[in-house]
Amino acid sequence: GQNITARIGEPLVLSCKGAPKKPPQQLEWKLNTGRTEAWKVLSPQGGPWDSVARILPNGSLLLPATGIVDEGTFRCRATNRRGKEVKSNYRVRVYQIPGKPEIVDPASELTASVPNKVGTCVSEGSYPAGTLSWHLDGKLLIPDGKETLVKEETRRHPETGLFTLRSELTVIPTQGGTHPTFSCSFSLGLPRRRPLNTAPIQLRVREPGPPEGIQLLVEPEGGIVAPGGTVTLTCAISAQPPPQVHWIKDGAPLPLAPSPVLLLPEVGHEDEGTYSCVATHPSHGPQESPPVSIRVTETGDEGPAEGSVGESGLGTLA
């Protein structure tokens, strides 16, 4: 038999070999497709099947607009002018090329040594489903489950039967300072069909480095509090994932569970001192904040102590 590939919605003509080009003709077309449960013999006189498969005057079979349900086998049996029986057998598959794939929610930059979501590649309206592949600097990226992770999802439209594919790429770049280019391509897996490519995205890879701007916020401002009052120290750090935060008072670690917030309720003179927070990030060592000074005083008429919090509420080094 012959394999035929037809685009969804397009007409397809299958010739009946050996059939005389004009009536009288002795021929029989039968089909076994998604529209049938077994073999359906088409009436030469035509009928309700003509909208999907119609015998033409020359004996050929016309499928006016092929659909997914027309995939299957088509057979013609004809008697030629010399009385010899000739058979034709076709295996029909249909396809639909989707729209150009797109990378949605692309990253703005990547950080070395940690997992980074590059983006999600989306292809809509394919048949059969096909596949999405990622490329790095023009070379096929093979997911290894460690440095390169791909999460895939395939959905089928309940009415059209066409597929939507999504592929989310996560990578762990080994070193900073590079500018890798990522792209994604869709392939139907049919012969003579070139893949469809997304526009490439070029991303900067930065070294993990210390988190930018570890800051110690104190409430009340200035770090001066009356006896019995409450002091709240907050370690603000712009790092993902959030690091573990420990607290130091007068150079010694406080025996507390890690937390970005230190609450000192009902303070007394024993709580006075210099406080700082230490953030420990998995990809780099500990980083200590500038210290702040806490003073417990009966009256609030003293100016800010050296190294305490100024108007901004941010701990700064004097």
């Epitope: 529209r35 049938t36 077994a38 009436s43 035509g46 009928g47 309700p48 003509d50 909208s51 999907v52």
Partner: antibody
Framework: EVQLVESGGGLVQPGGSLRLSCAAS????????MTWVRQAPGKGLEWVAS????????YYPDSVKDRFTISRDNAKNSLYLQMNSLRAEDTAVYYC????????????WGQGTLVTVSS | DIQMTQSPSSLSASVGDRVTITCRAS??????VNWFQQKPGKAPRRLIY???NLADGVPSRFSGSRSGTDFTLTISSLQPEDFATYYC?????????FGGGTKVEIK
């Protein structure tokens, strides 16, 4: 709303002619086959004629072949049935229906128009 | 030509009854059968398409089934508005053929 409205029915003498019309609205007319079905008084339903979406191919049962002609004007969203050589047994309510091929069957029907053939 | 033999031609039933109507095709028509409901002086209304699929807006008490060339319309719990005449139609071959109809009357 999908709607089919028949017109043109009436009283006609045996041997006479009549032309029925069906105005379609609420759907893309040229995407569908169209069909005429009739129902004699107190009787069941009988297929009369079908036409494909382009109007190139028409289909009839033996009972009306060579006497009735189905046609369509896709620009006017209209279906027609030209009935010639009418007989008493053609007396019926004539319904216009959407479909007639295996994709649809018959899904939407008009309200019908009565044709009476009598002398 | 295909014959669609519909039975019974009439039946009497009460509100709440389960009603079954059958059409037998004289040859294989695949799934290409519709069921219609018709009330006096009105056009037929499609209930079931392609043997088993409920048409839009049709109550779920109506269902269609198929076994080979036998097609069945079932009304699980008859309602007052269901008293009408029911027809099957095969649309696999020309001539398109309707069953003779089943009149469902109040007992």
């Amino acid at each position: 709303e999908v709607q089919l409205v028949e017109s043109g029915g009436g009283l006609v003498q045996p041997g006479g002619s009549l032309r029925l019309s069906c105005a379609a609205s609420g759907f893309t007319f040229n995407n569908y086959w169209m069909t005429w079905v009739r129902q004699a008084p107190g009787k069941g339903l009988e297929w009369v004629a079908s036409i494909d979406n382009s109007g190139d191919n028409t289909y009839y049962p033996d009972s009306v072949k060579d006497r009735f002609t189905i046609s369509r004007d896709n620009a006017k969203n209209s279906l027609y049935l030209q009935m010639n050589s009418l007989r008493a047994e053609d007396t019926a309510v004539y319904y216009c229906a959407r479909g007639g091929d295996i994709r649809v069957g018959l899904d939407v029907w008009g309200q019908g128009t009565l044709v009476t053939v009598s002398s | 030509d295909i014959q669609m033999t519909q039975s019974p031609s009439s039946l009497s039933a009460s509100v709440g009854d389960r009603v079954t109507i059958t059409c037998r095709a004289s040859q294989d028509v695949g799934i290409y059968v519709n069921w219609f409901q018709q009330k006096p002086g009105k056009a037929p209304r499609r209930l079931i398409y392609r043997a088993t699929n409920l048409a839009d807006g049709v109550p779920s008490r109506f269902s269609g089934s198929r076994s080979g060339t036998d097609f069945t319309l079932t009304i699980s719990s008859l309602q007052p508005e269901d008293f009408a005449t029911y027809y099957c139609l095969e649309f696999d071959e020309h001539p398109l053929t309707f069953g003779g109809g089943t009149k469902v009357e109040i007992k």
